[in-house]
Every structure is written in C-alpha cells, then in structure tokens.
C-alpha cells in the first residue's frame, strides 16, 4: 500500500515547538512525501518560499538512507488561486511552457514527481484540467526516454460531490495519473452554522441531502463509480481537526455555533487545530465518539473540535483495504505530533504511524 504524506513549507514559520523542517521527518514512515507548495511564475514552475531550495535539499536527503522513498513537489494550493491555474491551463502556449519547465525543475532539485493541487478547476476548466494532465504525462514519458526513471504524476482532488461533478473528468484523468489523492476531509465547516465532523468515515444517522454526500464512504464510492481505478485511489486522512465556537449550552453534533473555533497556540488559524494541539486541548475536555461515523469529537467550555485519533484512522485504513484502494494520504506530517512530545506516547508521528501499522497489518 502507498502512504502518501504531505509536508507544508509554511510550517517552518510556526513558533517554538510548532516549527517543522523537512529534516524532522521520518524517512521510513511514508512511501511518498509531497512537498507543498510550488509556485508558477511567468508560466514556469518556481519556488514559493525564500528558502525552498534549502528545504528541497533537506527533504530529498531523506532518500539517501531510504532509496525506496519517493518525493513529489505539489504545485498550486489554496493561496495560488484557481484563476491563475485556469489562465495557464486554458492557453495552449502558457500550458506548453509550464509543462516544459517541470521536468528540469524536478530533476534539478531531486524530486521524483509532480503533484497537481489545482484547488479547484471551475466548470469551464474541466476539459483544460484533463488536457493539462494528459500533456504533462506525455512530457514525462518523452523526458524519460534516454533511460531515466519516469517522473510520477499525481493530483489532489476534492471529495465534495459538487466539485467532483463540475471540475473533473474522473475516467479520463485517471488514465494519466499514477495516483489520485482524494481529500476526504473538510466536509463540514463553520459555514454550516452547526457543529459537525469534517472527516466522517460514514454518513451520519441524521444526514439528509446534501449532507448524505459529506462523508468519506460516499466520496470514495462516487469516485470509483465515475471510473477511478481503486488501484490508483489514495484516501485522505487528516492529522488536523476542525473546531467551532458553540453558541449555546448544546454540545452535540448539530449544535448551533457562533463561528469557527479559537486559533491554536501554534497553528494560529481559526477553526483548525493540529493533532498535537488537540492532544493538549483534550486535557480537561470531554471526548465523544460519533458511532455511525466512526470518528471522535471533543468539547471544552465553548469549544468543539472534530478530529481523527488512532482508533478512527485504523477504521479508515480498514475501510480503504476493504475497498482495495491504493493506500492512504496524510495531510499533513507537520500537523501530526512530529516531535512526539505532545501526545504522550514517546512516539513521533503517532497518527501517521497508526496508519502505517494498519496498512501493514494482515
């Protein structure tokens, strides 16, 4: 099984114990590590952070002691913006320039492949996204002709039904991608006005349309029905939780909220807590399991957080094995307890390790 793990370059800027550099990663933990994100400037793939080249080196040095490890560079992301991707993909010359710029950039910096993180193609971009993938793959095949190992091509796709329908020609893009990471999280957010888990495995008992689509099981099944081969589908598992501020004394699933949760001590983003921050949040908190959805949530005062723990990730891995998927994807290594000091098990990356162990279990 594949264990595809994302690392985010901006995690270096978190203060104190939240700061994570690629040299803190475990070279034997994942089969693939994806560095997020690269930029595109003047239609050429480019660095994003001032020290990306140094960090690329740190990451790819991990392969010295584990030659089986594959590293990919992810291009795009939320801050890149869909419009910029759209302009490049829809213009033949821009697309060609971009595609041509990728292999030398990846080779120079020691990467084994490219991950496309166009978040998200619009309805009009659907065909252009397919073309971009098809042409990128063709370039990778051509570039490998002189006996080089062919560069890998993957894409991170939304798990939301509406986005899947408007953005992707699943059957076609699947032919050209080495694997597809389906982002089976962020199904529920503060915009709903109520508490809810952002990455449930199954549909909740109360879920009516459109909520019946907002779960991992539906998204995976839908992708398979649309023609994604199970052998290429990698299921996303988050090492972060989504939090809410409660608006009343109600604390269960579906309780009214006044907005996102308070920012974490290290991640400092309203509505999001890293797993390592959640381990601290749990001190003095009340933990519940949403039995049907097979995921936990915790409450403390006016804060509510839905997250994944070692039990829920094992359930998710068992599910993906039952469906004969290619493996699991983790967003993100730097949100797991990468130091091993927050969650009290004397174990670095406890969630990712739990996923790895479950994948290996017979």
């Amino acid at each position: 099984y594949k264990l595809v793990c994302y690392y985010t370059s901006w995690s270096q800027y978190r203060e104190g114990d939240g700061s994570c550099f690629p040299d803190a990663l475990d070279r034997f933990l994942c089969t693939h590590i994806i560095y997020s994100f690269a930029n595109i400037s003047n239609d050429h793939i480019d660095t994003w952070e001032w020290n990306d080249v140094t960090l690329y080196g740190m990451l790819n040095t991990l392969k010295n002691r584990n030659p089986n490890l594959k590293t990919l560079l992810s291009v795009g992301g939320w801050n890149f913006g869909s419009q910029r991707f759209s302009k490049i993909a829809s213009n033949t010359q821009s697309r060609r320039t971009f595609i041509k710029s990728v292999p030398p950039f990846l080779r120079t910096h020691g990467f084994d492949g490219l991950d496309l993180a166009w978040l998200y193609p619009g309805r009009r971009d659907k065909q252009h996204f397919t073309t971009l993938i098809k042409e990128m793959k063709a370039e990778f095949i051509k570039e490998a002709q002189p006996g080089k190992k062919q560069l890998l091509l993957s894409a991170a796709l939304s798990a939301g039904k509406v986005t899947i329908d408007s953005s992707y020609d699943i059957a076609k893009i699947s032919q050209h991608l080495d694997f597809i990471s389906i982002m089976t999280y962020d199904f529920h957010g503060a915009w709903r006005g109520t508490t809810g888990h952002h990455s449930p495995l199954f549909r909740g008992q109360e879920d009516a349309s459109p909520d019946r689509f907002s779960n991992t099981d539906y998204a995976v099944g839908y992708m398979l029905r649309l023609g994604a081969p199970a052998s290429k589908l990698v299921m996303g598992i988050p090492t972060f939780g989504r939090s809410f501020t409660l608006a009343s004394s109600e604390t269960g699933v579906g309780a009214p909220i006044s907005g996102p949760g308070i920012p974490g001590r290290f991640t400092k983003e309203a509505g999001t807590l890293a797993y390592y921050e959640i381990c601290d949040f749990l001190r003095g908190a009340t933990v519940h399991r949403i039995l049907g959805q097979q995921v936990p949530y915790a409450t403390k005062g006016n804060q509510w957080v839905g997250y994944d723990d070692q039990e829920s990730v094992k359930s998710k891995v068992q599910y993906l094995k039952d469906r004969q998927l290619a493996g699991a994807m983790v967003w993100a290594l730097d949100l797991d307890d990468f130091q091993g000091s927050f969650c009290g098990q004397d174990l670095r990356f406890p969630l990712t390790n739990a996923i790895k162990d479950a994948l290996a279990a017979t």
């Epitope: 974490g264 921050e277 601290d280 001190r283 403390k300 005062g301 804060q303 927050f342």
Partner: antibody
C-alpha cells in the same frame, strides 16, 4: 516584546476583598493560552491557585481555593483574580503566568498582597 | 489530590559538580510528560528550565537535563556554576487541570 504585569496588590484588612489584574502586552488572549495565578508566601514555596484556558473559557481551581477565588478573562489582554474573605495566611506575592507546560511560558514580576489589621 | 514530592532539600555541591533532584508524583501526570522544572532566585519570578519532562526551554544551558515519565522525574544539573544557586520547583499537570500542583521545592547551594 511579550510581557505580563500584575497589579492590584497592596494592604488589605482581614475579611476583605481584593482583585488582582494580569495585563498582557505584545500578545493577546485570542488564541489558546493556559493562564494561571500562582502565589508564594514569604520564605515558602510556589502554590498554584487557579487557571483559565483562554480558548475555551474553562476555569480551574486548586481544591483549597475553590469558593474564595475567582479567575476571569476580562478582556483580550487581561485576566483577573478576585479574592474574598482574606486572612493573614493569604499574605504572599501573587504571580501571573502563561503556559507553564510549554516553551511559550511567561511570568509577571509579581504583586505583593499583605493581609493585616 | 495528587501530590508532588521533591527530594532532597537542601542539596549542596561544589562548582563543576553535578546535582540531581527528583520529583515523585503520587499519580501519573497528563500524557506522562506534563512536568515542568523552574528555577527561582530570591525576589524574582520563576524561570522555566524544562518542559514536557525533557525539553530544554529556549536560552537554558544544556547543563540542565530533564528526564522521566509518568510519576518519576529527575532534573540533573551538571558542571555546576555559582549562578545555579537557587530553589528549583517541579510542576505537574494532570488530566483534570484542577489537580495541577508544584513540588515543595529544592534549594541548591553551590560551595
């Protein structure tokens, strides 16, 4: 520069009430911080009185402190400790501290409370 | 309520020597590592030395070392300096934060 400063200490008569204020500068309580009040009687050790999780608003008290002491987040930069029914045994330097279990730990210089007639 | 017992007190050692202070908790601290060590000098607030049982706080010399897990913790000060003369406290955090408590303190005398 991040700082904590305690204020409100002074001389108070037995049975009296006092409110101590801890004021933060260089940061605010819009994130998760574990803010606590610690006291130290002259020549004695440190004693944890109360704490507040600024993220969730949950408050915690040492068993001996419950009832006479009240910790509150009164603004995005202030945490207070209200003390009632004071006795001579409450004479101490009162410290405000942030995150004692993290590298982000910070202490104020302390404020002296003297309970005497 | 859980208790933290520090031993010995006082303790004295020569400059360049090593001092070991133990902190025994009556029940396991949260996540087995919610234990901090502080140094306090007269007229000053405490200063964090070690947190999460073994992590050295920023700016603290590596002569200070924390170890232990669960209920038994140790602070070791090696290559003792005159400036290390102070009282040292452990602080334990528990699953119920209302149970958090300091140890009684250990005075270190440098000869």
């Amino acid at each position: 520069q991040e700082q904590l400063v305690e204020s409100g200490g002074g001389l108070v008569t037995p049975g009296g009430t006092l409110t101590l204020t801890c004021t933060a500068s260089g940061f605010d309580f819009s994130s998760y911080y574990y803010m606590c009040w610690v006291r130290q009687a002259p020549g004695k050790g440190l004693e944890l009185i109360a704490a507040i999780d600024t993220g969730s608003g949950e408050t915690y008290y040492a068993s001996w402190a419950n009832g006479r002491f009240t910790i509150s987040k009164t603004s995005s930069t202030t945490v207070t400790l209200q003390m009632t029914s004071l006795t001579a045994a409450d004479t101490a330097t009162y410290f405000c501290a942030r995150d004692p279990y993290f590298g982000t730990n910070l202490w104020g210089p302390g404020t002296l409370v003297t309970v005497s007639s | 309520d859980p208790m933290l017992t520090q031993t010995p007190s006082p303790v004295s050692a020569a400059v360049g020597g090593t001092v070991t202070i133990t902190c025994q908790a009556s029940q396991s601290v949260y996540n087995n590592n919610y234990l901090s060590w502080f140094q306090q000098k007269p007229g000053q607030p405490p200063k964090l030395l070690i947190y999460k049982a073994s992590i050295l706080a920023s700016g603290v010399p590596s002569r200070f070392k924390g170890s232990g897990s669960g209920t038994q913790f140790t602070l070791t000060i090696s290559d003792l300096q005159c400036d290390d003369a102070a009282t040292y406290y452990c602080l334990g955090g528990y699953s119920s934060p209302s149970d958090d408590a300091f140890g009684g303190g250990t005075k270190v005398v440098v000869e």
